[in-house]
């Protein structure tokens, strides 16, 4: 998977009036990494692993960048014309990626009340707008404002692309993220299901990177997909991931079943506890 940095900013309006403050989160390689603390005007690391990425850095640049982006987004929301009564949100998601072949990608997406209405490839500066008439109207509104704003020139988009990649590279250079492997802890549990059946659950936790194979086997053969239930691979807040797989089996046949795990070239099997 490519390394990625993802900025997620949200601003709100109430009855057409843009609210002060904004919400901001940054994800690094899919993990919650930074959160903007509005009360203290500070970018705060999310968990120990995030602190480890930049050691004793003050996060002053991240703080200022997020604050500037938040102000920009509030100004953009103020220029959306069709704001009805009640609560509305404008969200900007900006992502940059560095792939294994060192190629890069950057994009920016705008959502109004949770609906995507404008995207831009920051490398080619190509805009795309969904087909709906609402999206078209919103996109025209925002693009007109961005054109008027002197900051949103060609060089500005190039800088957004370059800055995102520069930050991503800086985080990767810390060595905490780059090419690290944390093997999963695997735990198998059982619980009573319907009469004569039990549910067995295999949990893998605290692993990195996120790619993992976790499946139930019967007599050494993987069960079919439709007889197993999988959980999503989710960040656990410590810079690592967690997931699970469960299946229902007949009581008394536990010894025939094992949980098979494969991660970063290593694999293991785990029996059902008796």
């Amino acid at each position: 998977e490519p390394h990625s940095l993802r900025y997620n900013l949200t601003v709100l309006s109430w009855d057409g009036s843009v609210q002060s403050g904004f919400l901001a989160e940054v994800h690094l390689d899919g993990q919650p990494f930074l959160r903007y603390d509005r009360q203290k005007c500070r970018a705060k690391p999310q968990g120990q692993w995030a602190e480890d990425v930049l050691g004793n850095k003050t996060w002053d640049r991240e703080t200022r960048d997020l604050t500037g982006n938040g102000k920009d987004l509030r100004m953009t929301l103020a220029h959306i014309k069709d704001q009805k009564e009640g609560l509305h949100s404008l969200q900007e998601i900006r992502v940059c990626e560095i792939h294994e072949d060192n190629s890069t990608r950057s994009s920016q997406h705008f959502y109004y009340d949770g609906e995507l209405f404008l995207s831009q490839n920051l490398e080619t500066e190509e805009w795309t707008v969904p087909q709906s008439s609402r999206a078209q109207t919103l996109a025209m509104n925002v693009r007109n404002f961005l054109k008027e704003d002197a900051m949103k020139t060609k060089t500005h988009y190039h800088a957004m692309h370059a800055d995102c990649l520069q930050e991503l590279r800086r985080y990767l250079e810390s060595g905490v993220v780059l090419r690290r492997t944390v093997p999963p802890m695997v735990n198998v549990t059982r619980s009573e299901a319907s009469e004569g059946n039990i549910t067995v659950t295999c949990r893998a936790s605290s692993f990195y990177p996120r790619n993992i194979i976790l499946t139930w086997r019967q007599d050494g053969v993987s069960l079919s997909h439709d007889t197993q239930q999988w959980g999503d691979v989710l960040p656990d807040g410590n810079g690592t991931y967690q997931t699970w797989v469960a299946t229902r089996i007949c009581r008394g046949e536990e010894q025939r079943f094992t949980c098979y795990m494969e991660h970063s070239g290593n694999h293991s099997t785990h029996p059902v506890p008796s």
């Epitope: 009360q39 203290k40 005007c41 004793n56 003050t58 002053d60 640049r61 604050t67």
Partner: antibody, heavy 117, light 107 residues
């Protein structure tokens, strides 16, 4: 306008703790970090630490962790710094300064502390 | 801790001259440098933030430049009221640190 009013000069005995105050006005006290900075006579500036009045979160320079205690009183918009077991090394002017994105944009007039027996 | 080295310790110039103060960081701090002026018996005053950003109320003759490890504060036409000590401060790494200062004198 933003003002930081610091307490008057203090003459303290070695070993007797001293508490300096910094009263803020002209802005929302609980929205900004407050820094404390030391300046010995004829010397440069040294950052002691900062405190956020909203919940008293503190970030201290490790050099001062056993020397300085930062507190605030939100009801009076006042920040305090207590210096424990002062010695002649602690004789200095101490400034409070409002934080703006890690810069210090407004400064108090300073409090002179002299440690002498 | 980041060490900030300011040079020279004393600068002596004539009114109307252009003068530059140097601040060198012991490691890359990107643009996280700020400049302060402290007149005799006065409190420090913020002049420039983040290497080159101007501060409202500060005369336009003050400007800043640099990134990485080398930074410069420039006064493009010195006036008598500029006689003071000048300090740089970094905000990239805890703890925040200041340079030892450069004293500006008039010839």
């Amino acid at each position: 306008q933003v003002q930081l009013q610091q307490s008057g000069a203090d003459l303290v005995r070695p070993g007797a703790s001293v508490r300096l105050s910094c009263r803020a006005s002209g802005y929302s006290f609980t929205n900004y970090w407050m820094n404390w900075v030391k300046q010995r006579p004829g010397q440069g500036l040294e950052w002691i630490g900062m405190i956020h009045p909203s919940d008293s979160e503190t970030r201290l320079n490790q050099k001062f962790k056993d020397k300085a205690t930062l507190t605030v009183d939100k009801s009076s918009n006042t920040a305090y710094m207590q210096l424990s077991s002062p010695t002649s090394e602690d004789s200095a002017i101490y400034y409070c300064a409002r934080d703006d994105f890690f810069t210090m944009d407004y400064w108090g007039q300073g409090t002179s502390v002299t440690v002498s027996s | 801790d980041i060490l900030l080295t300011q040079s020279p310790a004393i600068l002596s110039v004539s009114p109307g001259e252009r003068v530059s103060f140097s601040c060198r960081a012991s490691q890359n701090i990107v643009t996280s440098i700020h400049w302060y002026q402290q007149s005799t018996n006065g409190s420090p005053r913020l002049l420039i933030k983040y290497a080159s950003e101007s501060i409202s109320g500060i005369p336009s003759r003050f400007s800043g430049s640099g990134s990485g490890t080398d930074f410069t504060l420039t006064i493009n036409s010195v006036e008598s009221e500029d006689v003071a000590d000048y300090y740089c401060q970094q905000s990239n790494i805890w703890p925040l640190t200041f340079g030892a200062g450069t004293k500006l004198e008039l010839k």
